[in-house]
């Protein structure tokens, strides 16, 4: 069954998928599609990489990690309820029927807006409140607590750092990961 990931409306959703290249720069084509992985390829392709680069993507779908090191995790920007569904990450390993397929279930819930305090001290009111950190069983969420006063540019930077530092290891542990070679 699919591993479940969650986000709230208006957030960026993150669907982890990883592989380990046989050698640095020795990349494998990857496709992401909406819908469960079919026998071949991806249905309703939203993003695709080849041996060198991202060669196809659609609005709001991008790879935020270092795909040259095998981090092909998908970010979906500014999600709505209609982004809920099964997503397929397919690592297209050369050879007959060698592909690795991962079905990831994304569930979007309505955003919960908390009344803003007089002075904006709560990071979570200015940026998505919950970030999924584990994929097994019921989606565990990590709520980000109070931080010092920061402006919007800092929020964006801080969000990236938080995701990269605090979540990447957790997600790598719990997400779709394979080693090649």
């Amino acid at each position: 069954s699919e591993v479940e990931y969650r986000a709230e409306v208006g957030q960026n959703a993150y669907l982890p998928c990883f592989y380990t290249p046989a050698a640095p720069g020795n990349l494998v084509p990857v496709c992401w599609g909406k819908g469960a992985c079919p026998v071949f390829e991806c249905g309703n392709v939203v993003l695709r990489t080849d041996e060198r680069d991202v060669n196809y993507w659609t609005s709001r779908y991008w790879l935020n990690g270092d795909f040259r090191k095998g981090d092909v995790s998908l970010t979906i920007e500014n999600v709505t309820l209609a982004d809920s569904g099964i997503y397929c990450c397919r690592i297209q390993i050369p050879g007959i029927m060698n592909d690795e397929k991962f079905n990831l279930k994304l569930v979007i819930k309505p955003a919960k807006v908390t009344p803003a305090p007089t002075r904006q001290r709560d990071f979570t009111a200015a940026f998505p409140r919950m970030l999924t950190t584990r994929g097994h069983g019921p989606a565990e969420t990590q709520t980000l607590g109070s931080l010092p006063d920061i402006n919007l540019t800092q929020i964006s930077t801080l969000a990236n750092e938080l995701r990269d530092s605090r979540l990447a290891n957790d997600l790598r542990d719990s997400g779709a990961t394979i080693r090649i070679g």
Epitope: T80, L81, A82, S84, G85, V107, I108, K109, P110
Partner: antibody, heavy 119, light 107 residues
Framework: QGQLQQPGAEVVKPGAAVKLSCKAS????????MQWIKQRPGQGLEWIGE????????DYNQHFKGKATLTVDTSSSTAYLQLSSLTSEDSAVYYC????????????WGPGTLVTVSS | DILMTQSPSSMSVSLGDTVSIICHAS??????IGWLQQKPGKSFKGLIY???NLEDGVPSRFSGSGSGADYSLTISSLESEDFADYYC?????????FGGGTKLEIK
């Protein structure tokens, strides 16, 4: 998929309040948001609001703020819609509906409760 | 509020026909649309969600399509149980808003 049960009808006097119930069974009550909808003949459908039974978080249609209050009782897997200061304009069928597995907000509906405001 | 304009308001059709009902939103709703069926004197049943997906147990003769602000529900090879009222609903924005409904009648 589960079931939603609602009483068939309620008759209430103008100015009074009424609390409508929607009893859920056959699914995990706290996992799915509940919607409430009003239907008046010739007036179409109006969305009243929604509630997350896991933490009682609510979103309301501004038109129903002060008129409608959404609550849940997780111990009995029941959602409630309370309507206050009733007038003839509140005479309608009120439905609860719950979301489906992929965040479809109006997947499964209760049978509705006909509220008649009459002296 | 997002206005959902549904057309036609009623149509007379025959068994076996294929019909389409249209909903136009007053802005882009990014496939955040559902289609509902209400039989006379009964409650509602969800048919389609997120523009194109069938709810559980809904026959494959029902289908949804569209993008942006324009969406449609198509029923192919109409059966007697399909004569009912149909509504669209958007849920991209609060408040959720419904179309005015389409009554499907037997010719």
């Amino acid at each position: 998929q589960g079931q939603l049960q609602q009483p068939g009808a309620e008759v209430v006097k103008p100015g009074a309040a009424v609390k409508l119930s929607c009893k859920a069974s056959g699914y995990t009550f706290t996992s799915y948001w509940m919607q409430w909808i009003k239907q008046r003949p010739g007036q179409g459908l109006e969305w009243i609001g929604e509630i997350d039974p896991s933490d009682n978080y609510t979103d309301y249609n501004q038109h129903f703020k002060g008129k409608a209050t959404l609550t849940v009782d997780t111990s009995s897997s029941t959602a409630y819609l309370q309507l206050s200061s009733l007038t003839s304009e509140d005479s309608a069928v009120y439905y609860c509906a719950r979301e489906g597995a992929f965040s479809s907000p109006f997947a499964y509906w209760g049978p509705g409760t006909l509220v008649t405001v009459s002296s | 509020d997002i206005l959902m304009t549904q057309s036609p308001s009623s149509m007379s059709v025959s068994l076996g026909d294929t019909v389409s009902i249209i909903c136009h939103a007053s802005q882009d709703i990014r496939s955040n649309i559902g289609w509902l069926q209400q039989k006379p004197g009964k409650s509602f049943k969800g048919l389609i969600y997120h523009g194109t997906n069938l709810e559980d147990g809904v026959p494959s003769r029902f289908s949804g399509s569209g993008s942006g602000a324009d969406y449609s529900l198509t029923i192919s090879s109409l059966e007697s149980e399909d004569f009912a009222d149909y509504y669209c609903v958007q849920y991209v924005q609060f408040p959720r808003t419904f179309g005015g409904g389409t009554k499907l009648e037997i010719k």
